[in-house]
Interface confidence: low
């Protein structure tokens, strides 16, 4: 009795395997292996067994172990099964555009691969299996016909082979063809809907929206938007089977007048178009004039607003009397008017629509400098060694510079936290100075010693 181990082996093409041949008797007359494969005996063996390494196994083979024992000669075969994955898995090209509702035939060719009994060919839509067939013939050709629906647009169809060796080597080898993407389409007979401003101002931005329902597949639709000779660059938002193209448009003085706005939606090899008229106008902002933008307090100031000859203006919310393109009023400047805004609003009618423009100017009032008791107290009494912050605020426009000095040299640290010492006591002369002049004020600091508390 001759034994062989392992009795069955599955191995990759070109691989190697160790095979043990053994005899049932202790001292066989002969023990060996017959095989066309390259073999190498692995030494040392035993009295009644030998180990061989078979290499470069390219195809299925049945090496035979033989032994000659006193009770007779016998042999045993090991079954070597070679596996290799297909060399080519290819899906035939799909039509460029496929009408919804028509059947599509998928065809896959597979070259090579073994063992064929474990090789399955699948036609896939994405990862969904459409058909599973055995690989027959060389090359193996597998076909299936599938109905095409809307949900097939953009779907990837591919062909996959599975060499399932899991019962043997716990491995599943997959080869997948390059995917082919299917395109289907449906364009409705209705024209797109176009929403845009009827009037558009020179050098300003307007928004144009073009939309269309009943499109399929909406993601493949292309939109062309143009105003006169100007091509627009829309941002497209997709719904279930609708799209909306939104674009900003800016026009120049050369385009003033009426222009054609065109929206075209293209899908497959068809187009639907809509046209609309847009009036382009020029309307400069009104002018707001002050007799002087910067005046001293008490000065009289004239505020004047002037706009487009056909416009009507309002100055600080008060309409011109009589209504027209010009308005004005007079005021006496006070410190409270410093930074005050004067706003002029102009309204113009263009192609039946009212358009508005605003302009604002600011008045600067020069005043001061000032040093008031409220903001710069004349007397402070603080305990010695306490933490205090001397405060003195000067007012004016332009903002005055403030210095407080004792005996012309010792500064009072305005706005800083200090520890009160005897040195701080005394009378300080605070001086606020700006380009408009200067004011002074005396500030007395009294320090209470602990012994007087």
């Amino acid at each position: 009795q001759t034994s062989v181990f392992p009795p069955e082996v599955i191995l990759p093409r070109g691989g190697s395997v160790k095979v043990n041949c053994s005899a049932s008797c202790d001292q066989p007359i002969s023990l060996g292996m017959e095989t066309p494969l390259p073999k190498k005996e692995i030494l040392p063996g035993g009295n009644n067994w030998k180990m061989y390494e078979l290499s470069n196994v390219q195809e299925d083979s049945q090496p035979m172990c033989y032994s000659n024992c006193p009770d007779g000669q016998s042999s045993a075969k090991t079954l070597l099964t070679v596996y290799w994955t297909p060399e080519r898995v290819e899906l035939a090209p799909l039509p460029p555009w496929q009408p919804v509702g028509k059947n599509l035939t998928l065809r896959c060719q597979v070259e090579g691969g073994a063992p064929r009994a474990n090789l399955t060919v699948m036609l896939l839509r994405g990862e969904k299996e459409l058909s599973r067939q055995s690989a027959v013939g060389e090359p193996a050709e597998v076909t299936t016909t599938v109905p095409v629906g809307r949900d097939d647009h953009g779907a990837n169809f591919s062909c996959r082979t599975e060499l399932d060796l899991r019962p043997y080597v716990l491995k599943l080898f997959e080869n997948t063809s390059a995917p082919h993407q299917l395109q289907t389409f449906d364009l409705p007979a209705t024209p797109p809907q176009l929403v845009s401003p009827q009037v558009l101002e020179v050098d300003t931005q307007g928004t144009v929206v073009c939309s269309l329902d009943g499109l399929f597949p909406v993601s493949e639709a292309q939109v062309s938007l143009a105003l006169g000779d100007q091509k627009l660059n829309p941002t497209i938002t997709y719904g279930n089977n609708s799209l909306s193209a939104k674009a900003s448009v800016k026009v120049t003085a050369e385009e003033e007048g009426t222009q054609q706005l065109l929206c075209g939606v293209m899908l497959g090899n068809q187009t639907q178009e809509t046209r609309q008229t847009v009036t382009i106008y020029s309307f400069p902002a009104p002018n707001v004039n002050l007799t002087k933008p910067e005046v001293s307090e008490g000065t009289e100031v004239i505020v004047e607003c002037e706009a487009h000859p056909r416009a009507k203006v309002m100055l600080n919310g008060v309409p011109a009397q009589p209504p027209g393109p010009r308005a004005q009023f007079l005021l006496k400047a006070t410190p409270e008017d410093n930074g005050r805004s004067f706003s002029c609003s102009a309204t113009l009618e263009v192609a039946g629509q009212l358009v508005h423009k605003n302009q604002t100017r600011e008045l600067r009032v020069l005043y001061g400098p000032r040093l008031d008791e409220k903001d710069c107290p004349g007397n402070w009494t603080w305990p010695e060694n306490s933490q205090q912050t001397p405060m003195c605020q000067a007012w004016g426009n332009p903002l005055p510079q403030l210095k407080c000095l004792k005996d012309g040299t010792f500064p009072l640290p305005i706005g800083q936290s200090v520890t009160v010492t005897r040195d701080l006591e005394g009378t300080y002369l605070c001086q606020a100075r700006s380009t408009r002049g200067e004011v002074t004020r005396e500030v007395t600091v009294n320090v209470l010693s602990p012994r007087y508390e």
Partner: antibody, heavy 118, light 111 residues
Framework: QSLEESGGRLVTPGTPLTLTCTVS????????MSWVRQAPGKGLEYIGW?????SAYYANWAKGRFTISKTSTTVDLKITSPTTEDTATYFC???????????????WGPGTLVTVSS | AFELTQTPSSVEAAVGGTVTIKCQAS??????LSWYQQKPGQPPKLLIY???TLASGVSSRFKGSGSGTEFTLTISDLESADAATYYC?????????????FGGGTEVVVK
Amino acid sequence: QSLEESGGRLVTPGTPLTLTCTVSGFSLSSYGMSWVRQAPGKGLEYIGWISFSGSAYYANWAKGRFTISKTSTTVDLKITSPTTEDTATYFCARGGDYGGSTYILNLWGPGTLVTVSS
Amino acid sequence: AFELTQTPSSVEAAVGGTVTIKCQASESIDSYLSWYQQKPGQPPKLLIYAASTLASGVSSRFKGSGSGTEFTLTISDLESADAATYYCQSYSGTITTSGGAFGGGTEVVVK
């Protein structure tokens, strides 16, 4: 990503019982799914698995006693003719993340208890 | 028939200590071995696969070693949360030989 077993209850010996594992957060078309059981106070016992393509494989001791099947979001384990020895918590588990091995189970359900008693 | 034998069946150690669990296969399974942790009332949790590779999110205090027929799981710097039953599992070969088989388990008690 989660698994949840259901269907565990008290049954009499010989009454077929089907347990269901509901998956969420991943696709059964990409993973092998295993069933493992644990008798009260005992260790884990591997029953079998179903591949992503739907082929079922069983441990030697489990052949003929269990049937594994699946839909797009569930994996079923049918105990064909329960005996008192089948009293256990049954777990479903997902494999296949590491080195493609079905048996490395990196996601488990909480388990469902089956009691077989007359 | 293929078997995985775990020793000891129970082990006790103090917090901060080290525990070693052995798993012996009845035939060579190369490095195709996983380790799982199971706490009462919970499903098992994958700790280690390929004999020594840590699964995602598992503390480096867990260390796996070995190949062929002898495997070891070492837990160092023991924490009270490590109290659980630990199982080894083979994934060599097919389900009818050694694939999927579990060891009998080792209970770790932390003092």
